[in-house]
């Protein structure tokens, strides 16, 4: 038994590692193998991650970690039985993907504007917290060319759009994702979709 | 936001015991070490103890064998069972929230060893 | 154990000047493990930087922190009134644990 792909992971800067690796062949990850984990530092312990099968010889683990700072360093152990398959270290602050906002709420009973709110997925005392940027993706379930990104860029979990730069009278869905530029992480995954039907009063035309 | 409010200092005679707590709101308690800080009147900062999440220990040299840090994350507090106390532990006593530096602080509580 | 020493022990300028506070470690220090705390009177110490040089969150920018290796400086770019303190260094090591330095304090010439 050899690891075809060494184990990579990503943080979320809160309490979850995700570590994902490949087999040289089909495995029963969850009864072959064990990754194990300790933080490098002086109070910590020895933990062990018990991986679920992803795919016929890939392998997932989700490590239960103490709230990240940026200097902490993991050593990983990953363990068939007796025999050590493979060594190496983890820095969560250098691989970081957010957790993906919640909460999408669109508002429609402001006057010709619509109000987008999310929540932020960290919480206040988390380093992220204010360091979320977002993007917001609108498109139109009739219409697959009618499709937009938003950047929000400022740290409220918010955009306000003028109603009438959508069509009128159809229907919409909306999502969102975070990243952070102090870490230089990925982007999280999108937030669950939400619906609405857009309408607006068009304005008279003057002749 | 977070806060680290402590309580239990007073005025304990040489070799008597005493208990400190400390409690934690605003952040996961769980998932950080707790420590406790001393300064002697008019002196500088000393480490005295600190805990992982979980349970492991770590004593400065100077109250090992008679300092006990403990935890209960349930209640989200941290606590310091002092014993055999001397004049030289005569102190106020910070519980902080860290790691490998202290980013919050209780407000002190002072413990005076005197006969 | 490794031992931190701070210069120079009070440090007497007028608010507007500049402030170079060092700190001097016994043996090499890692970047990641250096602290900086501010203390007033009465009042608990305040983290400052980590990690050498990072200001903590909701400290002013013209707090700085620099250095490596045995020698560290924390520097006031220009002092504020409320900026008159006693500021103190700290050190983590995986086996000796927790130091801090013996404090400098900034006081009004």
């Known amino acids: 038994m050899k690891v075809l792909q060494e184990p990579t992971c990503v943080s979320d800067y809160m309490s979850i590692s995700t570590c994902e690796w490949k087999m040289n062949g089909p495995t029963n990850c969850s009864t072959e193998l064990r990754l194990l984990y300790q933080l490098v530092f002086l109070l910590s312990e020895a933990h062990t991650c018990i991986p679920e099968n992803n795919g016929g010889a890939g392998c997932v683990c989700h490590l239960l970690m103490d709230d990240v700072v940026s200097a902490d360093n993991y050593t990983l152990d990953l363990w068939a039985g007796q025999q050590l398959l493979w060594k190496g270290s983890f820095k969560p602050s250098e691989h970081v993907k957010p957790r993906a906002p919640g909460n999408l709420t669109v508002h429609t009973n402001v006057s010709d504007t619509l109000l987008l709110t999310w929540s932020n997925p960290y919480p206040p005392d988390n380093y992220l917290y204010n360091h979320l940027t977002y993007a917001v993706n609108i498109w139109s379930e009739n219409d697959p060319a009618d499709f937009r990104i938003y950047n929000v860029t400022y740290l409220e979990p918010s955009l306000r759009i003028a109603a009438s730069t959508l069509k009128s009278g159809i229907s919409y869905r909306a999502r969102v994702r975070a990243w952070a530029q102090c870490y230089n992480t990925t982007w999280s995954e999108w937030s669950p979709s939400t619906k609405w039907h857009n309408s607006y009063r068009e304005p008279f035309e003057q002749h | 936001e977070v806060q680290l409010v402590q309580s239990g200092g007073g005025l304990v005679h040489p070799g008597g015991s005493l208990r400190l707590s400390c409690a934690g709101s605003g952040f996961t308690f769980s998932r950080n070490a707790m420590f406790w800080v001393r300064q002697a009147p008019g002196k500088g900062l000393e480490w005295v103890s600190g805990i992982g999440t979980g349970g492991a220990t770590s004593y400065a040299d100077s109250v090992k064998g008679r300092f006990t840090i403990s935890r209960d994350n349930a209640k989200n507090s941290l606590y310091l069972q002092m014993n055999s106390l001397r004049a030289e532990d005569m102190a106020v006593y910070y519980c902080?929230?860290?790691?490998?530096?202290?980013?919050?602080w209780g407000q002190g509580t002072l413990v005076t060893v005197s006969s | 154990e490794i031992v931190l020493t701070q210069s120079p022990g009070t440090l007497s300028l007028s608010p507007g000047e500049r402030a170079t506070l060092s700190c001097r470690a016994s043996q090499s220090v890692s970047n990641s493990y250096l602290a900086w705390y501010q203390q007033k009177p009465g009042q608990a110490p305040r983290l400052l930087i980590f990690?050498?040089?990072s200001r903590a969150p909701g400290i002013p920018d013209r707090f700085s922190g620099s250095g490596s290796g045995t020698d560290f400086t924390l520097t006031i770019s220009r002092l504020e009134p409320e900026d008159f303190a006693v500021y103190y260094c700290q050190q983590y090591d995986h086996s000796a644990g927790w130091t801090f330095g013996q404090g400098t304090k900034v006081e009004i010439k």
């Open positions: 990690g050498a040089s």
């Open positions: 902080a929230r860290g790691r490998y530096y202290f980013d919050y």
